[in-house]
């Protein structure tokens, strides 16, 4: 028995930040779970982890240097990624694992979300023109 996950097909990070919502066919209320976000077609990089427990505050961390936060809904986890770089444009997959109560449950692999990180274009400000030639 597998949990189904829905994600947006594509998101654009204009300001080097993005909210990626992972929606599950499972209610996480009063469950112990590990929600994670993985980068790349092979999911090789674990970007962020949200650990939830019925008796503790939500814990969010990244072992791979990403700046991330997480928010919990009844049937969703939203990952908020900041300070993304253009070269981190890639496909990102949501994963959910329910550790308690038994039995252990995880998800069918989702279609993923392509996160396109747009670089900040620094335009010269008209208020501070460069030195003009006489």
């Amino acid at each position: 028995n597998k949990i189904l996950v829905k994600q947006s097909p594509m998101l654009v990070a204009y300001d080097n930040a993005v909210n990626l919502s992972c929606k599950y066919s499972y209610n996480l209320f009063s469950r112990e779970f590990r929600a994670s976000l993985h980068k790349g077609l092979d999911s090789a990089v674990e970007v962020c982890v949200v650990y939830g427990n019925y008796s503790q505050q939500l814990q969010v961390y990244s072992k791979t240097g990403f700046n991330c936060d997480g928010k919990l809904g009844n049937e969703s986890v939203t990952f908020y990624l900041q300070n993304l770089y253009v070269n981190q444009t890639d496909i990102y997959f949501c994963k959910i694992e329910v550790m308690y109560p038994p039995p252990y449950l995880d998800n069918e692999k989702s279609n993923g979300t392509i996160i396109h990180v747009k670089g900040k274009h620094l335009c010269p400000s008209p208020l501070f023109p460069g030195p003009s030639k006489p």
Partner: antibody, heavy 120, light 107 residues
Framework: QVQLVQSGAEVKKPGASVKVSCKAS????????IHWVRQCPGQGLEWIGC????????NYNEKFKDRATLTVDTSISTAYMELSRLRSDDTAVYFC?????????????WGQGTTVTVSS | DIQMTQSPSSLSASVGDRVTITCHAS??????LNWYQQKPGKAPKLLIY???NLHTGVPSRFSGSGSGTDFTLTISSLQPEDFATYYC?????????FGGGTKVEIK
């Protein structure tokens, strides 16, 4: 209280196999990895591998991948480490320990250790 | 694999001394560094996790610092029960690896 209790000392001949058990109590078995770490006489600590009882997924140190087999029996909250084709340099104390599956970075509870002696 | 290098490998100190042990990782492990104490014939005990967090029940004379590749374990005032071997361990990526250990002996 939280405990990991290991099986007793073993003496084996080179080429044989050994199977060490680690019985967990006092916590939810499926919330934690079980890791195996060994310590050769007078040496440091060496990570062998780990198993997650929830889905029985394993991670192995490449050095032990061909000879170590990690298993669990969730019905009795017990983990096992079998090491085959034993050599004299496998003589060591073998520890089981745990790390949290959701917050996996340190080993907070350890078994008492099992001494395995390989000698002809 | 990430290599963990501890120094010194041994040191002699007196009760009341301030003792510092260092651990160097071969690549950036951010804060995913733990410290353990081991006494002869016993299993290791967790002292510090995530570089600077004191494990439950560990005396406050133990402290940890560092991030990236360089980490330090400090015992502010060495007590008789602190004579032991100390190990660092990286928990950033598998395979998890340990430093070679630092034996703290009585001067």
């Amino acid at each position: 209280q939280v405990q990991l209790v290991q099986s007793g000392a073993e003496v084996k001949k080179p080429g044989a196999s050994v199977k060490v058990s680690c019985k967990a109590s006092g916590y939810t078995f499926t919330s934690y990895y079980i890791h195996w770490v060994r310590q050769c006489p007078g040496q440091g600590l060496e990570w062998i591998g780990c198993i997650y009882p929830g889905n029985v997924n394993t991670n192995y140190n490449e050095k032990f991948k061909d000879r170590a087999t990690l298993t669990v029996d969730t019905s009795i909250s017990t983990a096992y480490m079998e090491l085959s084709r034993l050599r004299s340099d496998d003589t060591a104390v073998y520890f089981c320990t745990r790390s949290h599956y959701g917050l996996d970075w340190n080993f907070d509870v350890w078994g008492q250790g099992t001494t395995v002696t390989v000698s002809s | 694999d990430i290599q963990m290098t501890q120094s010194p490998s041994s040191l002699s100190a007196s009760v009341g001394d301030r003792v510092t042990i260092t651990c160097h990782a071969s690549q950036n492990i951010y804060v995913w560094l733990n410290w353990y104490q081991q006494k002869p014939g016993k299993a290791p005990k967790l002292l510090i996790y995530k570089a600077s967090n004191l494990h439950t029940g560990v005396p406050s004379r133990f402290s940890g610092s560092g991030s990236g590749t360089d980490f330090t374990l400090t015992i502010s005032s060495l007590q008789p029960e602190d004579f032991a071997t100390y190990y660092c361990q990286q928990g950033q990526t598998y395979p998890y690896t340990f430093g070679g250990g630092t034996k703290v002996e009585i001067k």
